[in-house]
């Protein structure tokens, strides 16, 4: 079961999964001026290898010399940086049977890369430089099926400014103001408003969200 | 551009109560702590205490603890400090300064004399 | 409370002339995050206090780059490159790792 929506924001923070589930689709996404190659459209994970590799060609249609030697270089590249990736993996990317690895990047990928995760994917959040986490619980959200609908749990990470943090750490009110109640996992409401929808998700990371704007 | 600006200077009478304003713009008010420090005449500063005006947790220093009561109003972006039972000791300069000691409002100076 | 003794009270310059000034702390100023919240500031006659450096060693923005800052632990120093009539006040170290925070008891650069 794909997961409905992608990982809720969390101000100043990134997330990353650390291995991917098996049924994992990441779109194959080119940067401006290249397109991908019609079989390519997504890579998927396949047990603990992904289907295939994405490719991006020019959108140009003028086959010169030079463009093709280019093509062959980008393939040889290509394979450079596929066989690099192999011995300096990330020590928490442990190979798991139906877990992938982060795929190694593609020649002229888009910036962002787009990842339909499934059903029991968990991701990992952490603050961008310049913040510092003000931590209640565990900095993840998990995809999980709930009445009948998938949906992201709340990471329990809030990231402030590092000039500002230990003020927090000082404070036993804001610490106490901290406490949230765990989400409840068991029934199902008539009503249901099981997960965060998109829009919904900065407005629920409470009181300690921080945007500076002014420096 | 961020800006603190500050009440009016203060003549109280000892023994009475006075509340000094902090007007903040140019940020989001609610995710900064206020900061509030005194500056006695001829002397060093002195931290009293300090509000996160997005919950009203405070920081305070044991010193002007029931001396001084740190609110904000949210709406206008106001920071507030009331220092009651005043003495001659409370004569001073006070500062509202946020983001740890970047920006800094002009000072309020309270006079305490009969 | 941490207290902060800087050093000297007062400082002679020439227009010109590089000065230091230290400010040591009664504990170690390294919070549990990994930060050091030390912090030097500038109060001109009449005016707030503007910040100059913070976190030890960090140039505030807009402040000139003959102000410099050093240390760790209790040992700090602001460094002056080539001093200048503005520059002409009071100075102040500011620790913000401990409650309550605490200023140093203040150094006043003058001309000579």
């Known amino acids: 079961e794909l997961c409905l929506y992608d990982p809720p924001e969390v101000p100043n923070a990134t997330f990353k999964a650390l291995s991917y589930k098996n049924g994992t689709i990441l779109n194959c996404e080119c940067k401006r001026g290249f397109r991908r190659l019609k079989e390519l459209v997504y890579m998927r994970c396949l047990g603990n290898s992904w289907s295939s590799n994405c490719q991006c060609t020019s959108n140009s249609h003028d086959k010169s010399r030079k463009q093709v030697t280019a093509q062959l270089e980008h393939q040889k590249e290509q394979q450079t940086t596929t066989d690099m990736q192999k011995p300096t993996q990330s020590m928490h990317q442990e190979n798991l049977t139906g877990h992938c690895r982060e795929p190694p990047p593609w020649k002229h990928e888009d910036s962002k890369r787009i990842y339909h995760f499934v059903e029991g994917q968990s991701v990992h959040y952490e603050c961008i430089p310049g913040y510092k986490a003000l931590q209640r619980g565990p900095a993840i959200s998990i995809c999980k099926m709930k009445c009948g609908k998938t949906g992201w749990t709340q990471p329990q990470l809030t990231c402030v400014d590092e000039r500002e943090h230990h003020r927090f750490l000082a404070s036993e009110e804001s610490q106490g103001s901290r406490n949230s109640s765990p989400e409840s996992e068991t029934s199902c409401p008539i009503t249901t408003t099981d997960f965060p929808q998109p829009t919904e998700t900065t407005a629920m990371t409470e009181t300690f969200v921080l945007t500076m704007e002014y420096k | 551009q961020v800006k603190l600006l500050q009440s009016g200077a203060a003549l109280e009478k000892p023994g009475a109560s006075v509340k000094m304003s902090c007007k903040a713009s140019?940020?989001?008010?609610?995710?900064?702590?206020v900061i509030w420090v005194k500056q006695s005449h001829g002397k060093s500063l002195e931290w009293i205490g300090e509000?996160?005006?997005?919950?009203?947790?405070?920081n305070f220093n044991a010193k002007f603890k029931g001396k001084a009561t740190l609110t904000v109003d949210k709406s206008t972006s106001t920071a507030y400090m009331e220092l009651s039972r005043l003495t001659s000791e409370d004569s001073a300069i006070y500062y509202c300064?946020?983001?740890?000691?970047?920006?800094w409002g002009q000072g309020v100076m309270v006079t305490v004399s009969s | 409370d941490v207290v902060l003794t800087q050093t000297p009270p007062t400082l002679s310059a020439t227009i010109g002339q590089s000065v230091s000034i230290s400010c040591r702390s009664s504990?170690?100023?390294?919070?549990?995050?990994?930060?050091?919240?030390l912090y030097w500031l500038l109060q001109r006659p009449g005016q707030p206090p503007q910040l100059l450096i913070y976190?030890?060693?960090r140039l505030e923005s807009g402040v000139p780059n003959r102000f410099s800052g050093s240390g760790s632990g209790t040992d700090f120093t602001l460094k002056i490159s080539g001093v200048e009539a503005e520059d002409l006040g009071l100075y102040y170290c500011?620790?913000?790792?401990?409650?309550?925070?605490?200023f140093g008891a203040g150094t006043k650069l003058e001309l000579k």
């Open positions: 300064t946020t983001y740890d000691f970047d920006y």
């Open positions: 500011v620790q913000s790792t401990h409650v309550p925070n605490t």
């Open positions: 976190f030890v060693s």
């Open positions: 509000i996160y005006p997005n919950s009203g947790a405070t």
């Open positions: 504990q170690s100023l390294s919070h549990t995050n990994g930060n050091t919240y």
């Open positions: 140019g940020y989001t008010f609610t995710d900064y702590w």
